[in-house]
């Protein structure tokens, strides 16, 4: 049964013959328990774990540092996965990033990154991006110079101000940067000109929030 | 460390011309909108002039409207004023500012440069 | 323009006591984005201006819990719970909603 094989990530069930999307238990190294993902096995290719996803406002993503690290909300909806197992699934080989985007007018768009991973946390979770490719805009919205992670409770941004409370939500802000996207869900009509919403500068602007996103990384190698 | 230092400054006649230079380091220069402030001696504080991170965008102050001219260099890390017909009452300490947050998402001045007297007098 | 109207413009007080600032806009200053652009900058003597409080009540990195702002649309105030010989300086509003920036005419706070 799925169950009982150990897969370290998305990309290890696709290759097991599950070629269907769904939510998908894997083990990752150095991990105590198995965690629940959702695995994208539809776009470019498949083998996509999905580490972060938003769609219809249902979950508030304005939390702390503790529920960042270790991931909140549910794997068929609305979810981050958590720091602590992005940081373990990257330790395990090299991941690329690929971030689906969705505006309120229906156009789709995407950022990928060749390489991906991010420190532990003692490192603030520190971002690291390489080779930024895609249809969201010709510059990298997501700072390729590497950023730590911020939330309410934990200021490590490069700014004077506290991004994270004033923009919402936890992200690898810089001063702040071009994107957040666990800021604030607003709805059709009310999603223009907000500076907290859902972020992704060189796709939509600096105050469109955006109506769906999805965060998903698979092994160079797949 | 964020540091804008600035020269230029100086003594210049009625109707004369000056340029200001603020050199920008320890930030990425090229992703934040720049200001010029000026205080008159003794006085408060006056916007002048405003250049977004690309240098698409500008805005100036009516009293220095087609006298005063804001340029940057994102290759030299660099922000320049021309000031140009200059008048007694431009007699003051300039300031460069950095907006606090990138991306020209105005929320005021989070660096301010050290200041430079300009004395217009004949 | 907006009219940015500071009191008192001069304020005498002891160390250890409160003070507290005013600032009057001729408009609201609450932006469609849901922000009040409302700074206030601290001028010492000799010294350049630095930022103490953005968006009329978020204190900057580095600036003291002494220091709070609070308001919304025209009204805005900036309190020092308990003074200190190192505030001495002019303080200033600034909003940013309307364009162009304007400043209040500073507040001078002396130590009595």
């Known amino acids: 049964r799925e169950e009982e094989k150990p897969f370290r990530d998305c990309a290890d069930v696709y290759q097991a013959g599950f070629n269907k999307s769904g939510i998908y238990t894997i083990y990752i190294n150095n991990m105590p328990e198995p965690k629940k993902v959702f695995c994208n096995m539809d776009v470019n290719g498949g083998g996509w774990t999905v580490i972060q996803h938003r769609e219809d406002g249902s979950l508030d993503f304005q939390r702390g540092w503790k529920e960042y690290k270790m991931g909140f909300g549910n794997p068929s909806g609305e979810y981050w996965l958590g720091n602590e197992f992005i940081f373990a699934i990257t330790s395990q080989r090299q991941y690329m990033l690929r971030i689906e985007l969705m505006d309120w007018e229906g156009n789709r768009a995407y950022s990928q990154y060749d390489r991906f991973h991010i420190g532990n946390e003692k490192q603030n979770y520190r971002l690291y991006l390489k080779g930024h490719t895609g249809t969201a805009g010709k510059q990298s919205s997501l700072i390729l110079h590497g950023a730590d992670f911020s939330t309410k409770d934990a200021d490590n941004d490069n700014c004077m101000c506290k991004c994270a409370l004033m923009l919402t939500g936890g992200w690898w802000f810089d001063a702040c940067g071009p994107s957040n996207l666990n800021g604030m869900f607003y709805t059709a009509g009310q999603n223009h000109g907000k500076l907290n919403g859902i972020k992704w500068h060189y796709f939509k602007g600096p105050s469109y929030s955006l109506r769906s996103t999805t965060m998903m990384i698979r092994p160079l190698d797949f | 460390e964020v540091q804008l230092v600035q020269s230029g400054g100086g003594v210049v006649q009625p109707g004369r011309s000056l340029r200001l230079s603020c050199a920008a380091s320890g930030f990425t220069f090229s992703s934040y909108g720049m200001h010029w402030v000026r205080q008159a001696p003794g006085k408060g504080l006056e916007w002048v002039s405003y250049?977004?991170?690309?240098?698409?965008?500008?805005y100036y102050a009516d009293s220095v409207k087609g006298r005063f001219t804001i340029s940057r260099d994102n290759a030299k890390n660099s922000l320049y004023l021309q000031m140009n017909s200059l008048r007694a009452e431009d007699t003051a300490v300039y300031y460069c500012?950095?907006?606090?947050?990138?991306?020209?998402?105005?929320?005021?001045?989070?660096?301010w440069g050290q200041g430079t007297l300009v004395t217009v007098s004949s | 323009d907006i009219v940015m109207t500071q009191s008192p413009l001069s304020l005498p007080v002891t160390p250890g006591e409160p003070a507290s600032i005013s600032c009057r806009s001729s408009q609201s200053l609450l932006h469609s984005h849901g922000y009040n652009y409302l700074d206030w900058y601290l001028q010492k003597p000799g010294q350049s201006p630095q930022l103490l409080i953005y968006l009329g009540s978020n204190r900057a990195s580095g600036v003291p819990d002494r220091f709070s702002g609070s308001g919304s649309g025209t009204d805005f105030t900036l309190k020092i719970s308990r003074v200190e010989a190192e505030d001495v300086g002019v303080y200033y509003c600034?909003?940013?909603?309307?364009?162009?920036?304007?400043f209040g005419q500073g507040t001078k706070l002396e130590i009595k």
């Open positions: 250049i977004s991170s690309s240098g698409s965008t500008i």
């Open positions: 500012a950095r907006d606090l947050l990138d991306y020209d998402i105005w929320t005021g001045y989070g660096y």
């Open positions: 600034m909003q940013g909603t309307h364009w162009p920036p304007t």
